[in-house]
């Protein structure tokens, strides 16, 4: 994993500017880790970044990331009067200029280096679960999820009407 | 057109049990987090029981008050939440709302009009 | 439990002046960088309306004088210029926690 200690930095100046035509309401430096404690790295390789779910040592710094809030009307036409309220969208960006984008066509996640204004395939709907965790579900493809998937993130479709285990799409947040 | 409405309110003695339930309609009532939330008469709202989806193995969570005693569950294919209340007292009196968290869940933002429940002997 | 406290109790307004009502929770309800923080409206005979959610976004529909702030423990909603049809009672609800735990409400009037 390769150290991200200078993303405080350019915080400020990245996201002062609007990003699809808005300011974040909020922005919130954090490691992400899995439900069951495994960290989310990002490792340069080949002049392309990595993403891994991996076990940290006992004393190895956690990666972090920026999470940029946007307020968002809900995509469905479930209600024209707006009752579906607003939602939360969440953009997550690791080091200066790239963002985590959802890859549906290869079930993936990637990290691809872009300019404002962000693609939607950069923006996920956060998902205020228990157990103070949270899931990202894909703007672009109702119903699918960032996900654990052989020690790495993947789009994980979710059905809401099944019954399955929901662990892998569960991610922690935390300033340390 | 969004809507819940609840049923099932009514006159109950002390020691008796009582079973409503929200009729929902207007959404995918599967993909919600539903809620009941209670007000007795002339005071603030209660928070009471909140049940997740299928997927989250329908998780139900409950306020100190009413836990053992309040039952939340939910049937995706009709489309309606109940909320089971048995060993009910004179403190459970109020009107009781069947709640919608949004999607993402940070708040409710769906009511129904609300059932009242009267216990008394 | 999170006890969330309200004050005014109850605060009367002249029509087109600001209402300021003020909530304080016993510990943060802040989590993920936010503050799980909502405000409600209740009128008589209705059900409560959202107003606010994680502290300073407006719900849907919501007119722009309403505006909430705060983070932490300390939270304001503040009305702008108050209307006839704000007469109501308002209530602070933080969704940090389970149980979510509402204030005890402000019930705003006319002067």
């Known amino acids: 994993a390769f150290g991200i200690s200078g993303v405080q930095k350019y915080t400020r100046a990245l996201h002062d500017s609007s990003i699809t035509g808005i300011s974040p309401i909020t922005e919130y430096l954090a490691s992400l880790s899995t439900y069951n404690d495994q960290s989310i790295t990002f490792a340069l390789e080949d002049e392309s970044y990595e993403i891994y779910v991996e076990d940290l040592k006992k004393d190895e710094k956690k990666d972090k990331v920026l999470l940029s809030y946007y307020e968002s009307q809900h995509p469905s036409n479930e209600s024209g009067d707006g009752v579906d309220g607003k939602m939360l969208m969440v953009t997550l960006s690791p080091t200066k200029d790239f963002w985590l984008h959802a890859n549906n066509k290869e079930h993936s996640v990637e990290l691809h280096k872009c300019e404002k204004p962000l693609p939607d395939q950069a923006f996920f709907v956060l998902h205020n679960m228990h157990s103070n965790c949270v899931s990202f579900e894909c703007k672009t493809d109702p119903g699918v999820f960032i996900g654990v998937k052989d020690n790495h993130l993947a789009l994980i479709k979710v059905d809401s009407s099944e019954n399955l285990c929901t662990e892998n799409i569960l991610f922690k947040l935390s300033e340390t | 057109e969004v809507q819940l409405v609840e049923s099932g309110g009514g006159l109950v003695q002390p020691g008796g049990s009582l079973r409503l339930s929200c009729a929902a309609s207007g959404f995918t009532f599967s993909n919600y987090w539903m809620n009941w939330v209670r007000q007795a008469p002339g005071k603030g709202l209660e928070w009471m029981a909140e049940?997740?989806?299928?997927?989250?193995?329908?998780?139900?969570h409950y306020a100190e008050s009413v836990k053992g005693r309040f039952t939340i569950s939910r049937d995706d294919s009709k489309n309606t939440v109940y909320l089971q209340m048995n060993s009910l007292r004179a403190e459970d009196t109020a009107v009781y709302y069947c709640a919608r968290r949004n999607y993402g869940n940070y708040y409710i933002n769906v009511w129904g009009q609300g059932t009242l429940v009267t216990v008394s002997s | 439990d999170i006890v969330m406290t309200q004050s005014p109790d109850s605060l009367a307004v002249s029509l087109g002046e600001r209402a300021t009502i003020n909530c304080r929770a016993s510990e943060s309800v802040d989590k993920f960088g936010m503050s799980f923080l909502n405000w409600y409206q209740q009128k008589p005979g209705q059900p409560p309306k959202l107003l606010i959610f994680?502290?300073?976004s407006q719900g849907s529909g919501v007119p722009d004088r309403f505006s909430g702030s705060g983070s932490g423990t300390d939270f304001t909603l503040t009305i702008s210029s108050l209307q006839a049809e704000d007469v109501a009672v308002y209530y602070c609800q933080q969704s940090k926690d389970i149980p979510y735990t509402f204030g005890q409400g402000t019930k705003v009037e006319i002067k």
């Open positions: 994680v502290a300073s």
């Open positions: 049940i997740t989806l299928k997927f989250n193995n329908y998780s139900t």
